[in-house]
């Protein structure tokens, strides 16, 4: 079974700088990626980010910068401009629409206790989601 | 509603420019990509490029390189696209549309009826 | 470029019939596919998207199919309305391509 993992990362060096990263774990190829911040894509959430494996990225405030990582992940760099750090709180989802599979989607955040540097393991959380 | 208005028709001589304009209503302008695409009469529909509204970021159709310019106002939420060295058969209707993330065309213009004649 | 192919460029039918538009792309694209109904004189319609979504407020007879190379626009029943040129739409790369339609008209 497809699953989608999501890891929350604090910048070591900028408290400020959060990266969100995402993996598909399945077969087929990816032809879309929503990433979405407050809840899944749809269903409450923000989105921050589409990827798309040909056509390029679009990306909205917060996002800084959403990449590639590999041809089944994606990283999206945010700017936190507030002082409070509301994304420490926040829950990201990814959703990754893998060819001919279907939609799978996985949600995450950083943990409570996360010291700058340290991220969540790369696990599926349980908010997971197949169209 | 979300709506796209473009400008008026355009009666222009081969070798001269034409820009037109399509103006966004009902959402925020910035957060979704404007495409260009044009119908020659009784011919079917060919894509030009897009227009990032948002860092004003431009993709082209190798065809139009060299001979197109798409910018945007974000204070009036209007996005341009202007053609130079026109040709006879640059006559066309010239559309934008607004780009559902990668997912095509959701919204479009009414369509600007551009006529290159001598 | 993708090359898509569209068929048939015309046909006739009659309200009520069952019909479908076919479209082949040179290469695989999987589901980046839209469909697009557009009236004389109007702006293209999304009624289709990543092949076999149905656009809001597009009725339930319209649907799509297929993935990698065959598509599919069916209309369960044609209704008086529908008589228009249906065009598809590669999304899969840069630059997007359209196939050359097909003008749905009266029997």
């Known amino acids: 079974t497809p699953e989608v993992w999501v890891q929350v990362q604090m910048e070591a060096t900028e408290l400020s700088s959060f990266t969100v990263h995402c993996g598909f774990l399945g077969p087929g190829s990816i032809s879309l990626v929503t990433v979405s911040w407050g809840g899944p894509d749809g269903a409450g959430g923000t989105k921050l980010a589409v990827l798309h494996p040909e056509l390029g990225t679009r990306q909205w405030a917060p996002a800084r910068q959403a990449r590639w990582e590999t041809q089944s992940s994606i990283s999206l760099a945010l700017e936190d401009s507030g002082a409070s750090s509301p994304f420490a709180n926040t829950t990201f989802c990814c959703k990754f629409a893998s060819f001919p599979e279907g939609s799978w989607e996985s949600c995450g955040s950083l943990p409570p206790s996360s010291d700058p540097g340290l991220s969540a393991p790369p696990t599926p959380v349980p908010i997971l989601r197949a169209d | 509603q979300v709506q796209l208005v473009q400008s008026g028709a355009e009666v222009k001589k081969p070798g001269a420019s034409v820009k037109v304009s399509c103006q966004a209503s009902g959402y925020t302008f910035t957060d979704y990509y404007i495409y260009w695409v044009r119908q020659a009469p009784g011919q079917g529909l060919e894509w030009m490029g897009w227009?990032?509204?948002?860092?004003?970021?431009?993709n082209y159709a190798q065809k139009f390189q060299g001979r197109v310019t798409m910018t945007r106002d974000t204070s009036i939420s209007t996005a341009y696209i202007e053609l130079s060295r026109l040709r006879s058969d640059d006559t066309a209707v010239y559309y934008c549309a607004r780009e559902d993330n990668f997912n095509g065309m959701d919204v479009w213009g009414q369509g600007t009826t551009v006529t290159v004649s001598s | 470029d993708i090359q898509m192919t569209q068929s048939p460029s015309s046909l006739s039918a009659s309200v009520g019939d069952r019909v479908t538009i076919t479209c082949r792309a040179s290469?695989?694209?999987?589901?980046?596919l839209g469909w697009y109904q557009q009236k004389p004189g109007k702006a293209p319609k999304r009624l289709i998207y990543?092949?076999?979504s149905l656009q809001s407020g597009v009725p339930s007879r319209f649907s799509g199919s297929g993935s990698g190379t065959e598509f599919t626009l069916t209309i369960s029943s044609l209704q008086p309305e529908d008589f228009a040129t249906y065009y598809c739409l590669q999304l899969n790369s840069y630059p997007l391509t359209f196939g050359g339609g097909t003008k749905v008209e009266i029997k």
């Open positions: 227009i990032n509204p948002n860092s004003g970021g431009t």
């Open positions: 990543a092949a076999s």
């Open positions: 290469q695989g694209i999987r589901n980046d």
